[in-house]
Amino acid sequence: SAHAHPRDSCPLGPGRCCHLETVQATLEDLGWSDWVLSPRQLQLSMCVGECPHLYRSANTHAQIKARLHGLQPDKVPAPCCVPSSYTPVVLMHRTDSGVSLQTYDDLVARGCHCA
Amino acid sequence: SAHAHPRDSCPLGPGRCCHLETVQATLEDLGWSDWVLSPRQLQLSMCVGECPHLYRSANTHAQIKARLHGLQPDKVPAPCCVPSSYTPVVLMHRTDSGVSLQTYDDLVARGCHCA
């Protein structure tokens, strides 16, 4: 199954495998300062780290990819660490009539897996 | 938006950016020969290639990731090429009572994007 050992034990050492990490970013960093008003700084959770064999496999495809990468590393890439789910965020932004609130469902990662 | 230029034009040259590629794999390659009977060989579509800035961005998060990677390449990884959808596959496999068919929804990639 996609959740087989060694799904959650990182063989590379602490903090090296696919995990969620917080990155501070300003609206200027994101190029959003002309239309987003607030918050001025976002705590963006992102997926970082390596995906050793079968670690946090997203699904059957990711397991196959990991196996074939072992057999044909030049042809098949290793799985990589990407979001498995997202946390909605509400932003205050400029509109023609003033300021409004809008939710973004796909902005901040909530969980990560290897796909 | 996630679909802004240069979403689909690869700046790295033909075949270098994130795309679907067919990889031939036998049941032995996959370690499935003891329980899958047929097909003996699978044409596995996989996602390969690089994800230059904004190319085939999966969503807002991927766009942000691309931008922050440009600003902090040591801290934020570039987006990577992963399946956006899958093609179901039917396999014939052994059971205690003989042989049965089973569909796998997450085995073969159908489309790719940068996440």
């Epitope: 008003l37 607030s38 918050p39 705590q43 965020v89 509400v90 205050m92 609130l101 939710t103 | -």
Partner: antibody, heavy 119, light 110 residues
């Protein structure tokens, strides 16, 4: 420790003005939005509006637009809710609440300010 | 009339399990997380569950939240007398921003 401390109960007459306050402490006041929530006697919670104390941007619920004014003074870490002309129907408990990191929920609440409007 | 619909009251005996439902639509619960607040008699509301199923520190694991489609529910197991309170669900609606359910009064019997 994060705390939101609101001003005391008020008894007013219809037509009078009023400004109630909510002082934040134990966190960076300008880094989190503050919302105001009304609870009429024996009723449920109603969201009134939100302010970003850092930029003083405000957004109101359509039901409260034009009825109240939300403001903040970041130098004293205080948010305000005010009325220019009270009505008997404004009688309620008013809560200030701090928004969580991503602006989708209220993680800390003030103790509430009871406003009674009666002739 | 609240945008999110909750039953006005639920009850249960000590030790029992009770659930409180919160029904919305595709413009609120369907697209955003649900949060739950507990309001003990005479006090301010307190965050109980955020982002569908997360408990803030200090909230006992007897409280749990879940969401499916356009509905959410709060479950309380091992009911205790001190759980007697009003419970509110809250989400975000594209037309009116932050919305609350009408509230559910939980009575602990006996």
């Amino acid at each position: 420790e994060v705390q939101l401390v609101q001003s005391g109960a008020e008894v007013k007459k219809p037509g009078e003005s009023l400004k109630i306050s909510c002082k934040g402490s134990g966190y960076s006041f300008t880094s989190y939005w503050i919302g105001w929530v009304r609870q009429m006697p024996g009723k449920g919670l109603e969201w009134m509006g939100v302010i970003d104390p850092g930029g003083s941007y405000t957004i109101y619920s359509p039901s409260f637009q034009g009825q109240v004014t939300i403001s903040a003074d970041k130098s004293i870490s205080t948010a305000y809710l005010q009325w220019s002309s009270l009505k008997a129907s404004d009688t309620a408990m008013y809560y200030c609440a701090r928004y969580g990191r991503y602006g989708t929920y209220f993680d800390y609440w003030g103790q509430g300010t009871l406003v009674t409007v009666s002739s | 009339q609240s945008v999110l619909t909750q039953p006005p009251s639920v009850s249960g005996a000590p030790g029992q399990r009770v659930t409180i439902s919160c029904s919305g639509s595709s413009s609120n619960i369907g697209v955003l997380y649900v949060n739950w607040y507990q309001q003990l008699p005479g006090t301010a509301p307190k965050l109980l569950i955020y982002s569908n199923d997360n408990r803030p520190s200090g909230v006992p694991d007897r409280f749990s939240g879940s969401k499916s489609g356009t509905s959410a529910s709060l479950a309380i197991t091992g009911l205790q007398a001190e759980d007697e309170a009003d419970y509110y669900c809250q989400s975000w609606d594209s037309s009116s921003n932050y919305v609350f359910g009408g509230g559910t009064k939980l009575t602990v019997l006996g």
